[in-house]
């Protein structure tokens, strides 16, 4: 707390300016009047407040605005922005993509502090969903957001918005993540050909089913091993080695680097040796010729 | 993280002149205002001179007509020449703006003597 002061002779602000840098904290808090700040917001950040001078700015809003802060003032808080705790963020009632953006702007190229997740969150559930403009604008400050979702949030994504998602943005999902995202990527690319759709959901193949790989290994895809690694282990041990080599065509003799590592590796024990054998790669470690494969799992199902 | 290296300091007589620099990472300056402040010993940081985000600069009533700020946004570098020096001018000088003024980052700075 700034202890009240008056204000000294001919210091009282008439407007904010950059002659404020020279004032004391003390000075501010007894020559600045709220209101004035409140209406010239946007001359804030044009002027190099210090850390010390930006808390005197908040403590004088906060007086103000005891409930929260007007949307008109929140857009123009610039660098004051970084002095808000997550408890002033949950006072806010931010509508406008234009006001989100200004304030993502001020954290822009530092990791997502707990202000712009608190942020971000009034946002997307004041707006009900996460929209492709507020998907577009978030991944585009924060390449990981969509990651950082959890799969309940994720599945207030609209198809729609799937659109806006670069492959850099799935980097850091999980499976549970990419199992809730693929079925939306799956419909919002449903009308793209072949080879287009498979560019589009390439990313996304971390949540497939098998009987879409198996469907992908029709169409001449040629899966990079980058991308087959990153599938579902469920989902690749039902294919066959025929499948296999379908789906990834030229780039089928990486398995060989990757044989020791899953779903490679649990793939390889599921197949028929001689048909590992096939592919000329050296693959080691497939049912040997004359063994039967029981599948428990279906046993046990039908018991 | 936004880094900040001030350089240029240096022991000066009475009159002299010093021209500081200051560099950051990033595009920090070109779109941030900046400020150059100074730590005398014993004393808390003050600003000497600023320069807003517009481009419009103000000086402390003990700088003016003596220093002068400037910025090259090409190589993301705040400047401050210093002339008619006084022992009263002996100080650490520190620049800081934007991201990093907001948060307290500061750099080392750079000292400057001025003794006969």
């Known amino acids: 707390e700034v202890e009240k002061t008056a204000c000294p002779s001919g210091k009282k602000a008439r407007e904010i300016d950059e002659s404020l840098i020279f004032y004391k904290k003390w000075e501010l808090e007894a020559c600045v009047d709220a209101a004035l700040l409140a209406t010239q917001m946007d001359r804030v950040n044009a002027i190099p407040f210090t850390y010390e001078q930006l808390d005197v700015l908040k403590h004088k809003l906060d007086e103000l605005y005891p409930q929260g802060y007007p949307e008109s003032v929140i857009q123009h808080l610039g660098y004051l922005f970084l002095k808000m705790s997550p408890e002033d963020i949950r006072k806010w009632n931010v509508t406008s993509l234009e006001t989100l953006k200004a304030l993502l702007e001020v954290n822009k190229g530092h990791e997502m502090s707990p202000q712009v997740a608190t942020l971000i969150d009034r946002f997307v559930k004041g707006r009900g969903q996460l929209d492709k403009d507020t998907l577009d604008t978030l991944t585009a400050f924060y390449p990981g957001y969509l990651c950082s979702l959890s799969p309940e949030e994720l599945s207030s994504v609209p198809p729609s918005s799937i659109w806006a998602v670069r492959p850099q943005d799935l980097d850091t999902c999980d499976p549970r993540q990419l199992d809730v995202l693929y079925p939306k990527a799956r419909l919002a690319f449903q009308n793209m050909n072949g080879s287009e759709y498979f560019v589009k959901i390439q990313s996304f193949l971390g949540g497939a089913p098998t009987e879409d790989l198996k469907a992908l290994s029709q169409q001449n895809v040629s899966m990079d091993l980058a991308t087959f690694m990153k599938l579902r282990t469920d989902a690749v041990l039902p294919l066959t080695v025929a499948e296999v080599q379908k789906l990834l065509g030229p780039h089928v003799e990486g398995l060989k680097a990757e044989e020791r590592h899953r779903p490679v590796r649990d793939w390889i024990l599921r197949q028929r040796q001689d048909d590992l054998d096939t592919l000329g790669l050296g693959l080691q470690g497939g049912i040997p010729n004359g063994y039967l494969v029981l599948d428990l799992s279906m046993q046990e199902a039908l018991s | 993280q936004v880094q900040l290296v001030e350089s240029g300091g240096g022991l000066v007589q009475p009159g002299g002149s010093l021209r500081l620099s200051c560099a950051a990472s990033g595009s920090m300056f070109s779109i941030n205002a900046v400020a150059w402040y100074r730590q005398a010993p014993g004393e808390q940081r003050e600003p000497v001179a600023a320069?807003?985000?517009?481009?419009?600069?103000i000086y402390a009533d003990s700088v003016k007509g003596r220093f002068t700020i400037s910025r090259d946004n090409a190589k993301n570098t705040v400047y401050l020449q210093m002339s008619s020096l006084k022992p009263e001018d002996t100080a650490v000088y520190y620049c800081?703006?934007?991201?990093?003024?907001?948060?307290?980052?500061w750099g080392q700075g750079t000292s400057v003597t001025v003794s006969p």
């Open positions: 800081n703006g934007g991201w990093s003024l907001a948060m307290d980052y």
């Open positions: 320069m807003t985000s517009g481009g419009s600069t």
